[in-house]
Amino acid sequence: VPPGEDSKDVAAPHRQPLTSSERIDKQIRYILDGISALRKETCNKSNMCESSKEALAENNLNLPKMAEKDGCFQSGFNEETCLVKIITGLLEFEVYLEYLQNRFESSEEQARAVQMSTKVLIQFLQKKAKNLDAITTPDPTTNASLLTKLQAQNQWLQDMTTHLILRSFKEFLQSSLRALRQM
């Protein structure tokens, strides 16, 4: 569209168009389906999904988690605080999703789809947020060194890290989904 020209090519549909909340809900469910596909490969490839040695690998990771103070749980629910937590958490997960990119053989495309669909979800949520100033973006230098550290781990730890990232991301999205449905 040339500058200053407000051309609207697609008319409003006859049936109700998707609302912001509906589309965000669908986007989260899309990512959750992607995580399930990736977890299937991880669990088939190794016995990580049944392992009890998770604490060993968990020490290296600082995966985002929902806490009471984030205002996303039913008790003490706070829409604005919670939305900031969801967006901040997703931004923090991005480095871990980058790590996953070379971790899958048969699901390479799915891993990319999970990464890209998370970026889209962040965009959708940022449009919904009123207090964007409260959202802290992770430091790129810190992320780069974390990525290097994770990639330097031995094979067992890398497999465990992959499993933990997927599990934590799934839990974070499920909590986000529940919270967003209250907004």
Partner: nanobody, 125 residues
């Protein structure tokens, strides 16, 4: 919008915007229809993961992209040929909301709910 008359080998950029709903929430396809021919899907882009798909006839020459901040989808057409002459339509649908969707299905018109009015592209010397 953005159609017009262009010489063979030239370029054009088509834009698709919407009123009354958010384009960013939908999978978008570009279709074209030449006189006396069936409507043909040329390119599409997902709203879920931004993946793209192109018909063989335009691969390497056309590029579909979206700017969610501007709520607009573009079709960059390079190395245009006389056989690209047609009315070009953008369309919006929800074909991309299920993980693992078949990307090649997105150039089928039945996947779309909402259609633009079209813009004429003529490639001629």
């Amino acid at each position: 919008s953005g159609g017009g008359l262009v010489q063979p080998g030239g370029s054009l950029r088509l834009s698709c915007a919407a009123s009354g709903f958010t384009l960013a929430y939908y999978g978008i396809g570009w279709f074209r229809q030449a006189p006396g021919k069936e409507r043909e899907g040329v390119a599409c882009i997902s709203s879920s993961d931004l993946s793209t798909y192109y018909a063989d006839s335009v691969k390497g020459r056309f590029t579909i992209s979206r700017d969610n901040a501007k709520d607009t989808v573009y079709l960059q057409m390079n190395s245009l040929k006389p056989e690209d002459t047609a009315v070009y339509y953008c369309a919006a649908g929800t074909w991309d909301l299920k993980f693992g969707y078949s990307r090649s299905n997105c150039v089928r018109s039945y996947e779309y709910d909402y259609w633009g009015q079209g813009t004429q592209v003529t490639v001629s010397s």
